[in-house]
Protein backbone atom coordinates (compact mmCIF):
# COMPACT_ATOMS: atom_id res chain seq x y z
CA UNK A 1 0.00 0.00 0.00
CA UNK A 2 0.84 3.80 -0.62
CA UNK A 3 2.71 5.14 2.23
CA UNK A 4 0.43 7.78 4.12
CA UNK A 5 1.26 11.58 4.00
CA UNK A 6 -1.38 12.27 7.01
CA UNK A 7 -1.98 10.88 9.85
CA UNK A 8 -5.54 10.41 12.18
CA UNK A 9 -5.67 12.53 14.98
CA UNK A 10 -3.62 11.51 18.33
CA UNK A 11 -0.75 10.17 15.55
CA UNK A 12 2.27 11.46 13.91
CA UNK A 13 4.04 10.87 10.96
CA UNK A 14 7.40 9.48 10.77
CA UNK A 15 9.60 7.69 7.84
CA UNK A 16 6.41 6.95 6.33
CA UNK A 17 4.75 5.72 8.86
CA UNK A 18 1.53 6.83 11.08
CA UNK A 19 2.63 6.28 15.09
CA UNK A 20 0.27 6.44 17.96
CA UNK A 21 1.49 9.49 20.23
CA UNK A 22 2.04 9.44 23.58
CA UNK A 23 -0.76 10.35 26.03
CA UNK A 24 -0.27 12.95 28.24
CA UNK A 25 1.55 12.11 31.39
CA UNK A 26 4.12 9.88 29.54
CA UNK A 27 6.88 10.90 27.14
CA UNK A 28 8.31 8.98 24.02
CA UNK A 29 10.52 6.11 24.37
CA UNK A 30 10.58 4.50 20.95
CA UNK A 31 8.88 5.08 17.39
CA UNK A 32 6.21 2.51 16.58
CA UNK A 33 7.33 0.30 13.60
CA UNK A 34 5.37 -2.00 11.31
CA UNK A 35 5.69 -4.50 13.98
CA UNK A 36 5.52 -2.88 17.53
CA UNK A 37 3.25 0.04 18.84
CA UNK A 38 4.79 3.48 19.81
CA UNK A 39 6.89 2.85 23.20
CA UNK A 40 5.93 5.49 25.97
CA UNK A 41 7.31 5.95 29.85
CA UNK A 42 5.03 7.51 32.62
CA UNK A 43 6.78 11.25 33.19
CA UNK A 44 8.80 10.76 36.98
CA UNK A 45 8.11 12.55 40.09
CA UNK A 46 7.84 16.51 39.68
CA UNK A 47 7.66 16.18 35.90
CA UNK A 48 4.62 16.44 33.48
CA UNK A 49 3.66 16.58 29.79
CA UNK A 50 0.11 17.89 29.49
CA UNK A 51 -0.76 16.96 25.56
CA UNK A 52 -0.43 14.17 23.53
CA UNK A 53 3.12 14.14 22.61
CA UNK A 54 6.05 12.27 20.94
CA UNK A 55 8.44 14.24 23.41
CA UNK A 56 11.53 12.58 24.74
CA UNK A 57 11.81 14.52 27.86
CA UNK A 58 8.96 15.27 30.49
CA UNK A 59 9.23 19.12 31.39
CA UNK A 60 9.93 19.90 35.08
CA UNK A 61 7.06 20.93 37.55
CA UNK A 62 7.50 24.81 38.12
CA UNK A 63 9.13 25.69 40.79
CA UNK A 64 7.26 28.04 43.63
CA UNK A 65 10.15 30.01 45.02
CA UNK A 66 9.83 31.00 48.82
CA UNK A 67 12.30 33.44 48.25
CA UNK A 68 10.31 35.13 45.79
CA UNK A 69 7.19 35.03 47.45
CA UNK A 70 5.66 32.30 45.85
CA UNK A 71 3.86 29.69 47.18
CA UNK A 72 2.12 26.00 45.28
CA UNK A 73 -1.47 27.21 44.63
CA UNK A 74 -2.03 23.76 43.05
CA UNK A 75 0.85 20.66 43.14
CA UNK A 76 1.52 19.42 39.97
CA UNK A 77 0.43 15.86 38.41
CA UNK A 78 2.26 13.61 35.25
CA UNK A 79 -0.21 15.78 33.23
CA UNK A 80 -0.29 19.23 34.59
CA UNK A 81 2.28 21.44 35.79
CA UNK A 82 2.00 23.24 39.15
CA UNK A 83 0.33 26.24 39.77
CA UNK A 84 1.90 28.94 42.11
CA UNK A 85 0.29 31.65 43.81
CA UNK A 86 2.14 34.67 46.09
CA UNK A 87 1.98 34.54 49.37
CA UNK A 88 -0.65 36.62 51.79
CA UNK A 89 0.07 40.64 51.06
CA UNK A 90 1.18 40.10 47.44
CA UNK A 91 0.62 39.61 43.83
CA UNK A 92 1.83 37.85 40.78
CA UNK A 93 4.27 40.14 38.45
CA UNK A 94 2.90 38.56 35.48
CA UNK A 95 0.86 35.86 33.98
CA UNK A 96 3.47 33.20 34.55
CA UNK A 97 3.85 34.41 37.86
CA UNK A 98 7.02 33.43 38.49
CA UNK A 99 7.80 36.19 41.17
CA UNK A 100 6.08 38.87 43.44
CA UNK A 101 5.28 42.04 44.49
CA UNK A 102 3.82 43.94 47.72
CA UNK A 103 -0.27 44.79 47.10
CA UNK A 104 0.12 48.55 46.13
CA UNK A 105 -1.57 50.91 48.67
CA UNK A 106 -4.27 53.56 47.44
CA UNK A 107 -3.48 57.02 49.01
CA UNK A 108 -5.50 59.48 50.90
CA UNK A 109 -7.91 60.93 48.47
CA UNK A 110 -8.32 57.17 47.12
CA UNK A 111 -10.14 54.19 47.66
CA UNK A 112 -9.99 50.31 47.05
CA UNK A 113 -11.93 49.95 44.33
CA UNK A 114 -11.15 46.22 44.11
CA UNK A 115 -9.23 44.02 47.24
CA UNK A 116 -5.78 42.49 45.69
CA UNK A 117 -5.78 38.64 45.22
CA UNK A 118 -2.16 36.38 44.37
CA UNK A 119 -2.56 37.12 40.87
CA UNK A 120 -3.55 40.84 41.02
CA UNK A 121 -2.83 44.00 42.03
CA UNK A 122 -5.11 46.65 44.00
CA UNK A 123 -7.29 48.84 42.01
CA UNK A 124 -7.70 51.81 43.38
CA UNK A 125 -10.34 54.83 42.64
CA UNK A 126 -10.19 58.41 43.44
CA UNK A 127 -12.88 59.29 46.31
CA UNK A 128 -16.10 60.93 44.39
CA UNK A 129 -17.50 63.82 45.90
CA UNK A 130 -19.34 62.89 49.14
CA UNK A 131 -16.56 60.50 49.64
CA UNK A 132 -12.83 60.40 51.36
CA UNK A 133 -9.72 58.55 52.32
CA UNK A 134 -7.52 59.82 55.25
CA UNK A 135 -5.19 56.58 55.23
CA UNK A 136 -2.78 54.66 52.30
CA UNK A 137 -4.57 51.19 52.44
CA UNK A 138 -5.02 48.08 50.78
CA UNK A 139 -8.59 47.35 51.82
CA UNK A 140 -10.18 50.71 52.81
CA UNK A 141 -12.58 52.12 50.39
CA UNK A 142 -13.79 55.52 50.55
CA UNK A 143 -16.05 56.32 53.46
CA UNK A 144 -19.17 58.62 52.88
CA UNK A 145 -18.34 61.93 54.39
CA UNK A 146 -20.77 62.00 57.34
CA UNK A 147 -24.15 63.56 57.17
CA UNK A 148 -23.91 66.31 59.67
CA UNK A 149 -27.78 66.55 59.41
CA UNK A 150 -28.93 63.20 60.67
CA UNK A 151 -27.21 64.28 64.04
CA UNK A 152 -28.93 67.62 64.19
CA UNK A 153 -25.41 69.05 63.07
CA UNK A 154 -24.29 71.67 60.60
CA UNK A 155 -21.59 71.27 58.75
CA UNK A 156 -18.87 73.17 60.22
CA UNK A 157 -16.03 72.68 57.79
CA UNK A 158 -16.32 71.00 54.13
CA UNK A 159 -15.35 67.76 53.46
CA UNK A 160 -12.71 66.63 50.90
CA UNK A 161 -11.24 63.58 49.09
CA UNK A 162 -9.08 63.23 51.78
CA UNK A 163 -10.73 64.58 54.90
CA UNK A 164 -14.22 64.33 56.85
CA UNK A 165 -16.64 66.82 57.14
CA UNK A 166 -16.49 68.68 60.60
CA UNK A 167 -19.98 69.02 62.43
CA UNK A 168 -21.03 71.49 64.68
CA UNK A 169 -23.75 72.32 66.74
CA UNK A 170 -26.52 75.01 64.90
CA UNK A 171 -26.03 78.42 65.88
CA UNK A 172 -29.45 79.28 68.07
CA UNK A 173 -31.08 82.27 66.93
CA UNK A 174 -31.07 84.77 69.50
CA UNK A 175 -34.44 86.52 70.78
CA UNK B 1 12.57 -7.23 35.35
CA UNK B 2 11.90 -7.87 31.29
CA UNK B 3 12.99 -10.99 30.23
CA UNK B 4 12.52 -13.87 27.06
CA UNK B 5 13.01 -17.31 27.98
CA UNK B 6 12.87 -20.07 25.29
CA UNK B 7 12.23 -23.59 25.49
CA UNK B 8 11.57 -26.48 22.97
CA UNK B 9 14.56 -27.01 21.03
CA UNK B 10 16.40 -30.76 20.86
CA UNK B 11 17.79 -33.27 18.45
CA UNK B 12 15.56 -34.26 15.89
CA UNK B 13 15.59 -36.32 12.67
CA UNK B 14 15.41 -34.67 9.11
CA UNK B 15 12.12 -34.33 7.99
CA UNK B 16 10.19 -34.37 11.20
CA UNK B 17 8.82 -31.25 12.97
CA UNK B 18 9.48 -29.10 15.96
CA UNK B 19 7.98 -26.40 17.77
CA UNK B 20 9.88 -23.49 19.86
CA UNK B 21 8.34 -21.30 22.23
CA UNK B 22 9.22 -17.96 23.90
CA UNK B 23 7.73 -16.25 27.25
CA UNK B 24 7.52 -13.38 27.94
CA UNK B 25 7.91 -11.21 31.12
CA UNK B 26 7.95 -7.64 32.34
CA UNK B 27 6.83 -5.63 29.22
CA UNK B 28 3.93 -5.27 27.73
CA UNK B 29 4.42 -8.75 25.34
CA UNK B 30 1.27 -7.39 23.51
CA UNK B 31 2.81 -4.33 22.39
CA UNK B 32 5.86 -5.32 20.96
CA UNK B 33 6.70 -7.20 17.54
CA UNK B 34 8.85 -10.28 18.20
CA UNK B 35 11.51 -11.72 15.96
CA UNK B 36 13.23 -15.09 15.72
CA UNK B 37 16.65 -15.04 15.37
CA UNK B 38 19.55 -18.10 14.64
CA UNK B 39 22.78 -18.94 14.86
CA UNK B 40 24.58 -21.87 13.47
CA UNK B 41 27.63 -23.42 15.49
CA UNK B 42 30.10 -20.80 14.66
CA UNK B 43 28.42 -18.92 12.36
CA UNK B 44 27.37 -15.49 12.39
CA UNK B 45 23.77 -14.05 13.40
CA UNK B 46 20.52 -14.61 11.06
CA UNK B 47 17.49 -13.57 11.01
CA UNK B 48 14.47 -16.22 10.36
CA UNK B 49 11.16 -14.61 10.71
CA UNK B 50 9.31 -11.29 12.82
CA UNK B 51 5.26 -11.19 14.21
CA UNK B 52 3.34 -7.99 14.45
CA UNK B 53 2.17 -6.70 17.74
CA UNK B 54 -1.13 -7.85 16.78
CA UNK B 55 0.04 -10.73 14.30
CA UNK B 56 -0.86 -9.43 11.22
CA UNK B 57 1.93 -8.80 9.56
CA UNK B 58 4.31 -11.90 9.32
CA UNK B 59 7.65 -11.89 7.32
CA UNK B 60 10.20 -15.00 6.86
CA UNK B 61 13.79 -15.23 5.68
CA UNK B 62 14.02 -17.15 2.27
CA UNK B 63 15.78 -20.36 3.76
CA UNK B 64 12.75 -20.87 5.91
CA UNK B 65 10.03 -19.82 3.99
CA UNK B 66 7.11 -22.37 3.41
CA UNK B 67 8.46 -24.69 6.28
CA UNK B 68 8.51 -22.48 9.18
CA UNK B 69 5.58 -20.37 11.13
CA UNK B 70 6.03 -18.06 13.62
CA UNK B 71 2.68 -16.81 15.94
CA UNK B 72 2.10 -15.51 18.99
CA UNK B 73 -0.77 -16.02 22.04
CA UNK B 74 -0.81 -12.34 23.65
CA UNK B 75 -2.80 -14.04 26.40
CA UNK B 76 -0.32 -16.40 27.25
CA UNK B 77 2.63 -13.61 26.85
CA UNK B 78 4.25 -16.19 24.46
CA UNK B 79 5.69 -16.37 21.02
CA UNK B 80 6.01 -19.40 18.95
CA UNK B 81 7.93 -21.03 16.01
CA UNK B 82 6.64 -23.99 14.08
CA UNK B 83 9.64 -25.60 12.76
CA UNK B 84 8.52 -28.39 9.72
CA UNK B 85 10.18 -30.35 7.39
CA UNK B 86 13.68 -29.58 8.89
CA UNK B 87 17.14 -29.62 7.56
CA UNK B 88 19.89 -30.11 8.96
CA UNK B 89 21.16 -26.44 8.39
CA UNK B 90 18.26 -25.49 10.39
CA UNK B 91 20.93 -26.55 12.79
CA UNK B 92 21.68 -23.60 15.49
CA UNK B 93 20.84 -22.08 18.73
CA UNK B 94 17.16 -19.61 18.11
CA UNK B 95 16.92 -16.67 19.67
CA UNK B 96 13.39 -15.04 20.52
CA UNK B 97 13.92 -10.85 20.31
CA UNK B 98 11.84 -7.94 20.44
CA UNK B 99 11.10 -5.52 18.09
CA UNK B 100 11.62 -1.53 18.71
CA UNK B 101 12.94 0.98 15.99
CA UNK B 102 15.74 0.53 18.16
CA UNK B 103 16.77 -2.65 16.92
CA UNK B 104 16.29 -5.95 18.82
CA UNK B 105 16.64 -4.37 22.40
CA UNK B 106 15.74 -7.71 24.54
CA UNK B 107 16.90 -11.23 23.58
CA UNK B 108 16.29 -14.41 25.63
CA UNK B 109 19.18 -16.72 26.12
CA UNK B 110 18.21 -19.10 23.18
CA UNK B 111 17.37 -22.89 22.62
CA UNK B 112 19.50 -25.48 20.44
CA UNK B 113 18.07 -27.32 18.05
CA UNK B 114 19.80 -30.00 16.15
CA UNK B 115 18.77 -31.52 13.26
CA UNK B 116 20.82 -34.86 12.73
CA UNK B 117 20.04 -38.86 11.57
CA UNK C 1 18.21 -7.81 -0.24
CA UNK C 2 20.74 -5.66 1.68
CA UNK C 3 24.24 -7.39 1.65
CA UNK C 4 26.30 -6.02 5.10
CA UNK C 5 29.92 -6.75 4.67
CA UNK C 6 32.18 -6.24 8.42
CA UNK C 7 35.56 -5.39 8.10
CA UNK C 8 38.07 -7.16 9.35
CA UNK C 9 36.93 -10.20 9.89
CA UNK C 10 39.14 -10.58 13.13
CA UNK C 11 40.74 -7.32 15.43
CA UNK C 12 43.62 -8.24 17.65
CA UNK C 13 44.60 -5.71 19.92
CA UNK C 14 45.33 -5.34 23.64
CA UNK C 15 43.22 -3.51 26.43
CA UNK C 16 43.47 0.11 26.42
CA UNK C 17 43.87 0.38 22.48
CA UNK C 18 41.20 1.85 20.33
CA UNK C 19 39.33 -0.77 18.00
CA UNK C 20 37.80 0.52 14.78
CA UNK C 21 35.38 -1.76 13.17
CA UNK C 22 33.90 -1.22 9.56
CA UNK C 23 29.71 -2.20 8.32
CA UNK C 24 29.85 -1.55 4.64
CA UNK C 25 26.33 -2.15 3.13
CA UNK C 26 25.66 -2.70 -0.89
CA UNK C 27 23.16 -0.33 -0.90
CA UNK C 28 22.18 2.81 1.21
CA UNK C 29 20.70 2.39 4.32
CA UNK C 30 18.73 4.37 6.44
CA UNK C 31 21.10 5.77 9.50
CA UNK C 32 18.15 5.25 11.63
CA UNK C 33 18.11 1.72 11.04
CA UNK C 34 21.28 0.51 11.54
CA UNK C 35 22.28 -1.23 15.02
CA UNK C 36 25.11 -2.39 16.67
CA UNK C 37 24.86 -5.74 18.56
CA UNK C 38 28.02 -7.33 20.97
CA UNK C 39 27.82 -11.23 21.16
CA UNK C 40 30.21 -12.83 24.00
CA UNK C 41 30.63 -17.03 23.77
CA UNK C 42 27.67 -18.57 24.75
CA UNK C 43 25.25 -15.82 25.19
CA UNK C 44 22.77 -13.78 23.56
CA UNK C 45 23.42 -10.83 21.53
CA UNK C 46 23.31 -7.29 23.31
CA UNK C 47 22.32 -4.10 21.60
CA UNK C 48 24.86 -1.72 21.99
CA UNK C 49 24.07 0.79 19.17
CA UNK C 50 20.68 1.91 17.29
CA UNK C 51 20.13 4.35 14.97
CA UNK C 52 24.04 4.28 13.75
CA UNK C 53 25.31 6.50 16.77
CA UNK C 54 22.45 6.32 19.59
CA UNK C 55 24.20 4.13 22.91
CA UNK C 56 21.44 1.55 24.06
CA UNK C 57 20.71 2.01 27.30
CA UNK C 58 23.71 0.93 30.23
CA UNK C 59 26.33 0.71 27.51
CA UNK C 60 29.42 2.75 28.46
CA UNK C 61 30.22 5.91 26.43
CA UNK C 62 33.49 4.51 25.19
CA UNK C 63 31.45 3.06 22.37
CA UNK C 64 30.44 5.15 19.72
CA UNK C 65 29.05 4.94 16.34
CA UNK C 66 29.12 7.16 13.14
CA UNK C 67 28.28 6.86 9.35
CA UNK C 68 25.83 7.00 6.63
CA UNK C 69 24.71 5.84 3.50
CA UNK C 70 26.64 2.57 3.01
CA UNK C 71 29.81 3.06 5.32
CA UNK C 72 29.26 2.36 9.16
CA UNK C 73 31.76 2.58 12.00
CA UNK C 74 31.83 0.90 15.16
CA UNK C 75 34.90 2.54 17.82
CA UNK C 76 35.53 1.55 21.32
CA UNK C 77 38.03 4.02 22.31
CA UNK C 78 40.13 2.23 25.14
CA UNK C 79 39.25 -1.56 24.89
CA UNK C 80 38.70 -3.13 28.92
CA UNK C 81 38.85 -6.93 28.96
CA UNK C 82 35.30 -7.22 28.84
CA UNK C 83 35.02 -5.87 25.62
CA UNK C 84 36.50 -8.85 23.78
CA UNK C 85 33.83 -10.80 21.73
CA UNK C 86 32.47 -10.53 18.81
CA UNK C 87 30.37 -7.34 16.95
CA UNK C 88 27.67 -7.57 14.21
CA UNK C 89 26.00 -4.71 12.62
CA UNK C 90 22.37 -4.97 11.50
CA UNK C 91 20.46 -2.97 9.01
CA UNK C 92 16.34 -3.26 9.74
CA UNK C 93 15.27 -0.52 7.39
CA UNK C 94 14.70 -2.27 4.07
CA UNK C 95 12.97 -5.56 4.80
CA UNK C 96 12.49 -8.91 4.53
CA UNK C 97 15.02 -9.64 5.71
CA UNK C 98 16.74 -8.17 8.53
CA UNK C 99 20.21 -8.55 7.97
CA UNK C 100 23.21 -8.91 9.73
CA UNK C 101 27.21 -8.30 8.89
CA UNK C 102 29.06 -11.78 9.19
CA UNK C 103 30.88 -9.66 12.66
CA UNK C 104 34.03 -9.17 13.70
CA UNK C 105 35.99 -10.58 16.36
CA UNK C 106 37.65 -8.63 18.75
CA UNK C 107 40.60 -10.94 20.70
CA UNK C 108 43.51 -9.82 22.92
CA UNK C 109 46.79 -9.72 21.08
Known amino acids: PEPPTACREKQYLINSQCCSLCQPGQKLVSDCTEFTETECLPCGESEFLDTWNRETHCHQHKYCDPNLGLRVQQKGTSETDTICTCEEGWHCTSEACESCVLHRSCSPGFGVKQIATGVSDTICEPCPVGFFSNVSSAFEKCHPWTSCETKDLVVQQAGTNKTDVVCGPQDRLRA | QVQLVESGGGVVQPGRSLRLSCAAS????????MHWVRQAPGKGLEWVAVISYHASSKYYADSVKGRFTISRDNSKNTLYLQMNSLRAEDTAVYYC??????????WGQGTMVTVSS | EIVLTQSPGTLSLSPGERATLSCRASQSVSSSYLAWYQQKPGQAPRLLIY???SRATGIPDRFSGSGSGTDFTLTISRLEPEDFAVYYC??????????FGGGTKVEIK
Open chain 3, 90 to 99: QQYADYPPFT
Open chain 2, 97 to 106: ARDTSRGHDI
Open chain 2, 26 to 33: GFTFSSYG
Open chain 3, 51 to 53: GAS
